[in-house]
């Protein structure tokens, strides 16, 4: 019925408006409604203007697509001509009363199907149903995959490509690890993958300034070290360095009026030359304090070395040796005076004897046939050496003596000249000043070491060698090497060290073989004014340990391997060091700081006397230890 109506309307249009000209009213009669009439009539007038006589040629050249008036007018009511719909997006166009309807293809929308639907943004079908990438296209979309993935047959889902299986050599010498969409060439910690060489290369962490002071790079890692000899230790972050702090302050007060006799390990502490007119006899008076049992207090000789007098200590008692053209004598006597107290000593040459007094009490009288030193033309010339003698004298002594003496002298009066000469020399020299108060023991100031040669081989024992050590310690800082055995190749096959514990105000004791800690005794309170007693015994099979808290035999899987390393070193030659390490690499031991504090050492039943050391840092005190700093009310 609708098409019949259309045909009627078409016939009326032809008759009324093409074959004849029609006005708007006549046109309304054709369409029988205003909207269509209002739409048609202006366009009809355009057709008329286009196809009036004389304008045809121009019309053909114009944009008008119609060949004649009929076709121009007939096309006006058809809303789909010319096509209003987007050609790409429409499926069909339906003409309506002064309107049209574009039916869109799937994927298009809008009145004219001009808008593409973005299926990738469809809330009802997230990401267009794609598992990875959704690509919107005009009127459609498609799914794609990221690099390293392939599309499954459903064209929506992606599957990871395992590059490691596809190309086994893709990482060269590194380990290939497949990861979603990619692969990684993995290197062990401390190594970095080199794309060019397809291999793992060691990272030189040291070049990246990882460490505050010293850095040692090794394949796959690095270790930071701090210069313990300068008083630093590694901080907890294992990178930065911190000062080895004092845990037990000591009273290091000195006085220039007190002459320290052990300033030099080898050599004389003070040398004075006298040429005096009014004195023809030798005299020396002084107060003396020591815990040392043997050593030279003073040695005096004539300018030509023909006569000499030695005042020394042996077994804690005063000994006098003398030699001149008339006689040669040695005498020891009096009470033991190495008691740490001030003892007044006087040695005076009388006409026929030499008188030795302690606390003004005569303890020795040595007969002499003539003057000890002969005046030359009325002047007595004498050389006086404190705490030692010239090297050549050693062979001339009546009885050999170890000259080293850790002691102090005060209130001296030499050759009746009072303090003159000595005071001037020592006033400006801090290291010649003695500590005001001392206790028994040996003091390591944290600045040097002592070296001993000890033979650890025990032929009578099946073990072949053994190291039995007893340490009595009173540390002043919580970190330092107490004892070390050092091989000729600059390794440290055995060391006993102190380190500050992670738990506050306590210390750990480390036993190490080379740079490996074989045992750690944790959290001991060693920084106290009381001495701590440590013992350990080690041979090629065992390691036994005794601390204030426990006695135990150490055994663990790795110990035998470490003891084998020690055994090998002990079969060669080792030097024994107390108080620290010689110049060995920083990486040779877990700790390299000097020990600071008091320490007495007994090795294989022998109490070590620092005066007997092969070498000793001048600042180490062999037989005196500073007292613990007592806080006064004012301080």
């Amino acid at each position: 019925a609708n098409s019949l109506l259309e045909e009627t309307k078409q016939g009326n249009l032809e008759r009324e408006c093409i074959e004849e000209l029609c006005n708007k009213e006549e046109a309304r009669e054709v369409f029988e409604n205003d909207p269509e009439t209002d739409y048609f009539y202006p366009k009809y007038l355009v057709c008329l203007r286009s196809f009036q006589t004389g304008l045809f040629t121009a019309a053909r050249q114009s944009t008008n697509a119609y060949p004649d008036l009929r076709s121009c007018v007939n096309a006006i009511p058809d809303q789909c001509s010319p096509l209003p719909c987007n050609e790409d997006g429409y499926m069909s166009c339906k003409d309506g009363k002064a309107s049209f309807t574009c039916t869109c293809k799937p994927g298009w929308q809008g009145e004219k199907c001009e808008f593409d639907i973005n299926e990738c943004k469809d809330p009802s079908n997230i990401n267009g149903g794609c598992s990875q990438i959704c690509d919107n296209t005009p009127g459609s979309y498609h799914c794609s995959c990221k690099n390293g993935f392939v599309m499954l047959s459903n064209k929506k889902d992606c599957k990871d490509v395992d590059e490691c299986s596809l190309k086994p050599s893709i990482c060269g010498t590194a380990v290939c690890k497949n990861i979603p969409g990619d692969f990684e060439c993995e290197c062990p910690e401390g190594y970095r993958y080199n794309l060019k060489s397809k291999s793992c290369e060691d990272i030189d962490e040291c070049s990246e300034n990882m460490c505050a002071q010293l850095c040692v790079n090794y394949p796959g890692g690095y270790t930071c070290y701090c210069d313990g000899k300068k008083g630093f230790k590694l901080a907890q972050d294992q990178k930065s360095c911190e000062v080895v702090s004092v845990c037990l302050p000591l009273n290091l007060d000195t006085k220039y009026e007190l002459l320290y006799l052990a300033e030099q390990f080898a050599g004389v502490v003070l040398y004075l030359k006298f040429r005096l007119p009014e004195i023809s006899r030798f005299s020396a008076e002084f107060d003396f304090r020591t815990y040392d049992s043997e050593g030279v207090i003073l040695y005096a000789e004539s300018i030509d070395h023909s006569a000499w007098l030695l005042i020394a200590l042996r077994g804690g008692k005063i000994e006098v040796q003398l030699k001149n053209e008339h006689t040669s004598k040695i005498t020891t006597g009096g009470d033991v005076i190495n008691n740490g107290l001030w003892n007044m000593v006087s040695v005076e040459e009388l006409e026929h004897s030499i008188s030795i007094k302690i606390a003004k009490e005569a303890v020795m009288d040595i007969n002499k046939p003539g003057p000890l030193f002969k005046p030359e033309n009325g002047l007595l010339e004498t050389k006086v050496y404190f705490a030692g003698f010239p090297r050549k004298v050693e062979s001339e002594l009546i009885k050999p003596i170890n000259p080293r003496l850790d002691g102090c002298i005060r209130s001296w009066n030499l050759m009746k000249q009072g303090a003159s000469g000595i005071k001037e020399i020592i006033q400006e020299k801090q290291n010649k000043h003695c500590l005001v108060t001392v206790e028994k023991g040996s003091y390591y100031p944290g600045s040097g070491i002592a070296q001993f040669h000890i033979d650890y081989n025990n032929v009578s024992s099946a073990e072949g060698w053994h190291v039995n050590v007893t340490l009595n310690i009173r540390p002043s800082t919580g970190t330092g090497v107490m004892l070390a055995l050092v091989s000729g190749n600059n390794t440290v096959p055995f060391a006993v060290s102190l380190v500050d514990s992670t738990s506050e105000k306590s210390q750990d004791i480390l036993l190490s073989v080379e740079n490996t800690v074989i045992y750690r005794i944790q959290a001991l309170s060693l920084c106290s004014d009381q001495q701590s007693h440590l013992e350990f015994r080690v041979n090629r099979n065992n390691l036994e340990l005794s601390t204030p808290l426990k006695i135990e035999t150490i055994s663990h899987e790795d110990l035998q391997r470490q003891l084998a390393v020690l055994d090998k070193a002990m079969k060669a030659k080792v030097a024994t060091y107390l108080g620290g390490l010689p110049d060995v690499p920083f990486s040779a031991t877990p700790v390299n700081a000097f020990y600071n504090g008091c320490m007495e050492v007994n090795i294989n039943g022998v109490q070590l006397d620092l005066d007997e050391a092969i070498s000793k840092h001048n600042d180490i005190r062999a037989h005196s230890c500073p007292s613990v700093w007592k806080k006064t009310k004012n301080s």
């Epitope: 030359k273 040429r275 033309n377 000249q417 009072g418 001037e424």
Partner: antibody, heavy 121, light 109 residues
């Protein structure tokens, strides 16, 4: 530096006494022997004696024994030479001279500027 | 009492080496006489040069040196300078006292 500064010129009558001072600075006074030497007009030098400032011990040349006294005051590092019973031939410039090495007698290293003592009636 | 004798005067030229001597009336001068040499410049300015025969006093130029030559004590000036023009006294120790020589007037022309 070492300095020996002597007291000023004196004019004395015969039979009188004179006391010349010698102040020492720049060194430890007590460690060095002090000598006294004089030079009469147009004459050479004449050694008079020494004092040990530490002990106060003295020794005088025989010629001056009994007339010369050497003393010291360690608190002000000063040595003194007193001469009594002055005669006209005691007119001279008097010098103090200090040993140059501590406790080492007999090296006359440092000298004072001299004190002229005139004995005239 | 011993008498100590010196040359009364000597003349030298700048840069030359000159030796002054000191003789003892008691015999040879030895190290035990602890010979001293003292320089006197105008205005009674005395300076110790040498003590104990050959010990130069502090601050004394190295051109001055002391020694024993034969039986005499000697002061040698190596490379004399015009400012060395002065009177030089020697003093010798005799057991308990010093004796000075009469002095040598050195002219440096």
């Amino acid at each position: 530096q070492v300095q020996l500064v002597q007291s000023g010129a004196e004019v004395k009558k015969p039979g009188a006494s004179v006391k010349v001072s010698c102040k020492s600075s720049g060194h430890t006074f007590t460690g060095y022997y002090m000598h006294w030497v004089r030079q009469a007009p147009g004459q050479g030098l004449e050694w008079m004696g020494w004092i040990n400032p530490n002990s106060g011990d003295t020794n005088y040349a025989q010629k001056f024994q009994g007339r010369v006294t050497m003393t010291r005051d360690t608190s002000i590092s000063t040595a003194y030479m007193e001469m009594s019973r002055l005669r006209s031939d005691d007119t001279a410039v008097y010098y103090c001279a200090r040993d140059s090495q501590i406790l080492w007698f007999g090296e006359l290293g440092y000298w004072g500027q001299g004190t002229l003592v005139t004995v005239s009636s | 009492q011993a008498v100590v004798t010196q040359e009364s005067a000597l003349t030298t030229s700048p840069g030359e080496t000159v030796t002054l001597t000191c003789r003892s009336s008691t015999g040879a001068v030895t190290a035990s006489n602890y010979a001293n040499w003292v320089q006197e410049k105008p205005d009674h300015l005395f300076t110790g040069l040498i003590g104990s025969t050959n010990n130069r006093a502090p601050g004394v130029p190295a051109r001055f040196s002391g020694s024993l030559i034969g039986d005499k004590a000697a002061l040698t000036i190596t490379g004399a300078q015009t400012e060395d023009e002065a009177i030089y006294f020697c003093a010798l120790w005799y057991s308990d006292h010093f004796v000075f020589g009469g002095g040598t007037k050195l002219t440096v022309l």
